[in-house]
Interface confidence: low
């Protein structure tokens, strides 16, 4: 049997030893890097944190998720004629979001059997990959979206091609930088075997040459360039828009107009606090503490938090709902599991019977259809 | 029930080899650790190696030049080896067993008397 | 290799006296481990995970500890606790045991 080195290894927070030993294959006898974690790691990999608690809110995500941005996308790629640089960025949105969801069932699968990645090295690569890609996706495009929202109110001009040409190279570069930022996630091996779980970890355990310096730098920068600048500026953006809306007209209108604004708000500011501030400040705690003192006491913490930040893909649509006329028609029919042609039909017909009120009702069977929105 | 059995030679010269058997029963190997543990006389216990369910093992720095656990999972026993034996290698030899989780050796065996000497 | 130091070597104690072990370990560990092993028979699983007390074991026993510093005790001394404890570590190989502490009946 071949002993390579004792180099100390950490995960996330996992502390252990590299063991260099002879791993016995149906081929015959191949040396391979596998790591031993100290109990403490053990106890997290083999805990209801990591195999019930995350698949079940993985389990949502996915559930609720990919059917809704799934919709949004189909809504602002195929349903929506004027493509605002709202539209666009919600529809980038979307597909950051839908790009992270549908590898989830792999993730639910990996938490449920023991934390155990049986589908290979570049799978793994690609779900971590995107895993942090969304969530940096988000932050920017929600960014852009807020800015926008403001400019809007600022400066009320009707839609150009200029604008949406704008929007268009904005998204390009945004997932340019994307690609580049996370290029190192998907450079690193990410899975290591670890004999006394008898379990391939993904992303869970980590060398520690590359773990101490580099993963504390790494997310260090990008909470610093990709998480607190944007905020800064969306936090910005929503500042200014209230300013100006609380000053703005206050007919029926703008009233309406206002509260969809303030609720477009309130959601943003819930997906920074449950999403990304908790994420991004617990992976640079994290990191650090592993850095000074060897060990991390917030790994429980960290782990919640990662978890919490695919919730964006949840509050996404509510965001798309207080933005987008056209989702909102989509999301409220197909609750009501009717067509949109159905609904403006409808409208139709009342219409020319004179009921020219601006909220109308249509009513069949004991259900009430709002058929103005 | 759980029992773990070490068997082996009671005497062994110096410079020869060493082969121990630890037959187990009432467990799987694939689902258990099984390391091995010796306390020479009068002394305390000194950890030697364990093989991981995987099969894979993991050994005391100090011994693993001239040490092998290896196993039979279809016969439940896991195998020692240690060449060049000097007298400092006459102990009381135990295997031990280790769950996934928590860590601890829930069961020893009774542990078996090796001699080095000529 | 994490080394690890018990005190005091040995200890004996009266029926319904407080005894405290000791075991430091030369660099940070998780968690410690304690075994006691009685003349002439195999060791046996005493305190895991620190504080957790394996099966079997009265509740007059407890451990305590974190980084470097841990102790094993016993609220009140009873005859059947002479024996012989090790602490016992898992963070990193080779997993190493103390030397012993050998706890006699006075």
């Known amino acids: 049997t071949i002993q390579g080195t004792n180099r100390s290894s950490k995960g996330r927070s996992l502390i252990g030893k590299v063991d260099g030993t002879s791993h016995v294959t149906g081929k015959g006898v191949t040396v391979e890097t596998v790591f031993s974690v100290d109990e403490f790691s053990a106890s997290v990999l083999t805990g209801k944190l990591t195999t019930v608690f995350l698949p079940i809110v993985y389990t949502i995500v996915f559930v609720v998720g990919l059917p809704s941005n799934g919709m949004a996308l189909w809504v602002f790629l195929f349903r929506t004629k004027k493509k605002h640089p709202a539209v666009i960025y919600m529809a980038n949105l979307a597909l950051a979001d839908l790009l992270s969801v549908i590898w989830f069932p792999l993730k639910i699968a990996y938490h449920i059997h023991g934390n155990n990645w049986i589908y290979g090295e570049a799978l793994c690569n690609v779900l971590i990959g995107f895993f942090y890609g969304n969530m940096y996706c988000s932050i920017l495009f929600m960014t852009c979206l807020s800015v926008q929202r403001y400019w809007v109110i600022v400066n009320p001009m009707g839609h150009s091609r200029k604008k949406a040409n704008i929007a268009i190279g904005i998204s390009l570069a945004i997932w340019l930088l994307i690609l580049l930022v996370t290029i190192p996630l998907y450079v690193v091996k990410q899975t290591i075997f670890i004999p006394a779980l008898n379990i391939t970890t993904c992303h869970d355990v980590l060398p520690e040459q590359l773990l101490v310096g580099d993963m504390f730098n790494y997310f260090l920068s990008l909470a610093i360039g990709v998480f607190l600048f944007p905020a800064f500026l969306t936090a910005s953006a929503y500042v200014l828009m209230i300013r100006m809306l609380r000053s703005s007209a206050m007919d029926e209108n703008s009233e309406k107009k206002r509260k969809r604004a303030i609720k477009l708000i309130v959601t943003v500011l819930a997906m920074y606090l449950i999403c990304f501030t908790p994420s991004n400040l617990l992976l640079v705690v994290h990191y650090f503490l592993i850095k000074s003192q060897g060990q991390s006491h917030v790994y429980a913490l960290y782990i919640v938090a990662l978890c919490l930040s695919t919730l964006n893909s949840c509050i996404d649509p509510f965001v798309y709902y207080f933005v987008s006329h056209d989702f909102r028609d989509h999301a409220k029919n197909a609750l009501l599991c009717r067509s949109v042609r159905t609904v403006k039909q409808m409208q139709v017909s009342l219409t020319s019977k004179k009921h020219s009120r601006k909220s109308s009702s249509y009513s069949s069977s004991s259900t009430t259809v709002k058929t103005s929105y | 029930q759980v029992q773990l059995k070490e068997s082996g030679p009671g005497l062994v010269q110096p410079s020869q080899t060493l082969s121990l058997t630890c037959t187990v029963s009432?467990?799987?190997?694939?689902?258990?650790?099984v390391s091995w543990v010796r306390q020479p006389p009068g002394k305390g216990l000194e950890w030697m190696g364990i093989?991981?369910?995987?099969?894979?093992?993991a050994y005391n720095s100090l011994l693993k030049s001239r040490l092998s656990i290896s196993r039979d999972t279809s016969k439940s026993q896991v195998f020692l080896k240690m060449n060049s034996l000097q007298t400092e290698d006459t102990a009381t030899y135990y295997c031990?067993?280790?769950?996934?989780?928590?860590?601890?050796?829930?069961?020893w065996g009774q542990g078996v008397m090796v001699t080095v000497s000529s | 290799e994490i080394v690890l130091t018990q005190s005091p070597t040995t200890l004996a104690a009266s029926p319904g006296e407080k005894v405290t072990i000791t075991c430091r370990a030369s660099?940070?560990?998780?968690?410690m481990y304690w075994y006691q092993q009685k003349s002439g028979a195999s060791p046996k699983a005493w305190i895991y995970?620190?504080?957790k007390l394996a099966s079997g074991v009265p509740d007059r026993f407890s451990g305590s500890g974190s980084g470097t510093s841990y102790s094993f005790t016993i609220s009140s001394m009873e005859t059947e606790d002479a024996a012989t404890y090790y602490c016992?570590?898992?963070?990193?190989?080779?997993?190493?045991f103390g030397a012993g502490t050998k706890l006699e009946l006075k």
């Open positions: 093989i991981w369910t995987g099969g894979s093992t």
């Open positions: 016992h570590q898992w963070t990193s190989t080779p997993y190493t």
């Open positions: 031990a067993r280790r769950g996934l989780y928590p860590y601890y050796f829930d069961y």
């Open positions: 009432g467990f799987s190997l694939t689902n258990y650790h």
């Open positions: 660099s940070r560990v998780s968690n």
């Open positions: 995970e620190t504080s």
